[in-house]
């Protein structure tokens, strides 16, 4: 009896959909695996007789519930199928946006770039998929614990009237208000402001 794959799960970030599993202990030899997806009531092979413990399902429609399954095989024997259901638009993790930060005197000028999507044109980003897409920005004075959050209305934001010669850290994430779903924070970017632009009297 061939044991089934263990810990079967979907790892999906920005619609890069990777079905992952672990190979069970099996004394007779090395197992191979076949992963399938349900299409129009028929299961179709995606990865056949692979020795890998993952299979790329990024070509699935972003919409709707998909049934995926994987089994282990050895010679002419095979395990039972392990099934999971997956809805990409609901289940994919929103990866961190890109961010460009520029210091101008006592201001930080930020521009945000929505995450790119697997198997899409360069210009079709997560912002195109989700109508309610917005950004959350949090910033803080480096070395302090107090964080401030803002929700920019556009793909850019300016933090003005900051303390001069002070290092501020900024990070951004995607946020979907209609789903109350937050993405992953970008890595903090820390920049030092320069002088206060106000002219002394």
């Amino acid at each position: 009896m061939v044991p089934p794959p263990e810990n079967v799960r979907m790892n999906s970030v920005n619609f890069k959909n990777i079905l992952q599993w672990e190979s069970p202990a099996f004394a007779k030899g090395n197992l191979t695996f076949t992963a399938q997806y349900l299409s129009y009531r028929i299961f179709q092979d995606k990865c056949m007789n692979t020795t890998l413990t993952e299979c790329d399902f990024s070509s699935l429609s972003k919409y709707g519930d998909h049934t995926l399954r994987v089994r282990a095989e050895f010679a002419d024997e095979h395990s039972d199928w392990v099934n999971i259901t997956f809805c990409p638009v609901d289940d994919t993790i929103i990866g961190p946006p890109g961010m460009q930060v520029e210091v101008l005197a006592d201001s930080l000028h930020m521009r945000f770039l929505a995450p790119k999507i697997e198997n899409e044109y360069e210009t079709w980003t997560m912002k195109n998929v989700y109508n309610s897409w917005t950004y959350n920005v949090q910033y803080w004075k480096n070395g302090t614990d107090e964080k401030f959050q803002i929700t920019p209305q556009y793909d850019f934001e300016v933090l003005r009237n900051l303390e001069p010669w002070t290092t501020y850290c900024v990070q951004v994430r995607g946020f979907l208000p209609d789903r109350n779903k937050a993405g992953e924070w970008s890595e903090p970017v820390c920049e030092q402001t320069t002088h206060d632009e106000t002219v002394p009297s």
Epitope: S61, K62, V89, N119, T123, W124
Partner: nanobody, 124 residues
């Protein structure tokens, strides 16, 4: 039942132009995303371009960027693909497709309705 009908294909010399049309019959072309795809002889289906209804944004495959332009005329329920500076490698059957959910642009899996296709041949 919605039907998409492509037209405008034909034989054209390298460097020439063609304008493909995709008309919706039986319903308005009221879908979030309309895309153009192509299939060259002996090859798989390839995304060419799409247009989003909501913001009117347009998106292109690298191979056609700067040469092809997608547009839509809502009053005529038609989407166009203007193809300039055509090359031999653009030879293919071109298909128009409509997405009900509008979540994707390039992947054929994200489209629900398809036309029958129109042949474009680029040859001297």
């Amino acid at each position: 039942e919605v039907q998409l009908v492509e037209s405008g294909g034909g034989l054209v010399q390298p460097g020439g132009s063609l304008r493909l049309s995709c008309a919706a019959s039986g319903n308005s072309l009221d879908y979030p995303t309309i895309g153009w795809f192509r299939q060259a002889p002996g090859k798989g289906l390839e995304g060419v371009s799409c247009i989003s209804a909501s913001e009117g944004s347009t998106h292109y495959a690298d191979a056609v960027k700067g040469r092809f332009t997608i547009s839509r005329d809502n009053s005529k329920n038609t989407v166009y693909l203007q193809m300039n500076s055509l090359r031999a490698e653009d030879t293919a059957v071109y298909y128009c497709a409509a997405s009900l959910h509008g979540l994707g642009c390039k992947s054929e899996a994200d489209y629900d309705y398809w036309g029958q296709g129109t042949m474009v041949t680029v040859s001297s």
